[in-house]
């Protein structure tokens, strides 16, 4: 048994944030559970991760320098994603593992979500002043 | 899915009892299996449960040094040994299949019941 | 541990009466709640599970309501095959503690 994700197939980080939801067809408020974002083709850099247990609070952390947070809601956990930049423009995969009670669950892998960095655009400032008027 | 129980003991005070679960159906290691005990007048008591893939086990604080949950992967059978009895032990007891609803839990599937006496 | 208490402990009720007991919990099981039925000397039958989805083959007047901390089983038309034991079950962390049981009997 697999779980289903579902992700909106793209996004637009205008201001360098992004809310980057995972619905689940799996509810994980009774459940110790592992969601992670994934960056990549091949998943290769893990984003961040939330990390639940229906006793305690949620732990949300990164290990490879995103700024990230995590909410959970019954059947989803979104990310939320702040300071990206335009070269982090890639797909992005949402995961998820039930670790407990057992068995051990995880998901198929889902369609991503292609997260489109757009930079800031802010007027640069002139280098010289204008010529003043008298 | 079946779960067929062992059949009905009669025991002395201070002796123990091991009542076996024999599952059919369906894969064994992949669901865990509760055990129940209803006493006569008395509502159901949950007693724990045993997942026989990782042979993870969880008790009722009230059943520890009374119960203890075993299986044999072989036969795909769990076992419930109730040990030191006292008449208070006496009761139906039920093995439960527990299935995972899309993250809700239940008991859909139940053994017949073994009845345990304890009598001097 | 999470505290079941089940009410009423017994109801006395006719064919065709709309019955209804009740489950609260000392703290909120978010859904993690399922009702089943027992006759004596039978085991239990599964009737409800996460407090409101109704098991395939069980009788469209049995229904499931509540959350947070408090849940309902109704039967809407009491018929005889009705009569007997429930009991409400949550599955919020361990020990998955049983209610108290309602004795269903005929009036």
């Known amino acids: 048994n697999k779980i289903l994700v579902k992700q909106s197939p793209m996004l637009v980080a205008y201001d360098n944030a992004v809310n980057l939801s995972c619905k689940y067809s799996y509810n994980l408020f009774s459940r110790e559970f592992r969601a992670s974002l994934h960056k990549g083709l091949d998943s290769a850099v893990e984003v961040c991760v939330v990390y639940g247990n229906y006793s305690q609070q949620l732990q949300v952390y990164s290990k490879t320098g995103f700024n990230c947070d995590g909410k959970l809601g019954n059947e989803s956990v979104t990310f939320y994603l702040q300071n990206l930049y335009v070269n982090q423009t890639d797909i992005y995969f949402c995961k998820i593992e039930v670790m407990y009670p057992p068995p051990y669950l995880d998901n198929e892998k889902s369609n991503g979500t292609i997260i489109h960095v757009k930079g800031k655009h802010l007027c640069p400032s002139p280098l010289f002043p204008g010529p003043s008027k008298p | 899915v079946q779960l067929q129980q062992s059949g009905a003991e009669l025991k002395k005070p201070g002796a123990s009892v091991k009542v076996s679960c024999k599952a059919s159906?369906?894969?064994?290691?992949?669901?865990?299996i509760h055990w129940i005990k209803l006493r006569s007048g008395q509502g159901l008591e949950w007693i724990g449960w045993?997942?026989?893939?990782?042979?993870?086990?969880q008790y009722n604080a009230q059943f520890k040094g009374k119960a203890t949950l075993t299986a044999d992967k072989s036969s795909s059978t769990v076992y419930m040994e109730l040990t030191g009895l006292t008449p208070e032990d006496s009761a139906v007891y039920f093995c439960?299949?527990?299935?995972?609803?899309?993250?809700?839990?239940?008991?859909?599937?139940w053994g017949q019941g073994t009845l345990v006496t304890v009598s001097a | 541990d999470i505290q079941m208490t089940q009410s009423p402990s017994s109801l006395s009720a006719s064919v065709g009466d709309r019955v209804t007991i009740t489950c609260k919990t000392n703290?909120?099981?978010?859904?993690?709640l399922a009702w089943y039925q027992q006759k004596d000397g039978k085991s239990p039958q599964l009737l409800i599970y996460?407090?409101?989805h109704l098991v395939e083959g069980v009788p469209s007047r049995f229904s499931g309501s509540g959350s947070g901390t408090q849940y309902s089983l109704t039967i809407s038309s009491l018929q005889p095959e009705d009569f007997g034991n429930y009991y409400c079950?949550?599955?919020?962390?361990?020990?998955?503690?049983f209610g108290g049981g309602t004795k269903l009997e005929i009036k």
């Open positions: 045993f997942y026989p893939g990782s042979n993870d086990i």
């Open positions: 079950q949550h599955f919020w962390g361990t020990p998955n503690t």
């Open positions: 996460a407090a409101t």
């Open positions: 159906g369906y894969t064994f290691t992949e669901y865990i």
């Open positions: 703290e909120n099981i978010y859904s993690n």
């Open positions: 439960a299949r527990r299935d995972d609803f899309s993250g809700y839990d239940a008991l859909p599937y």
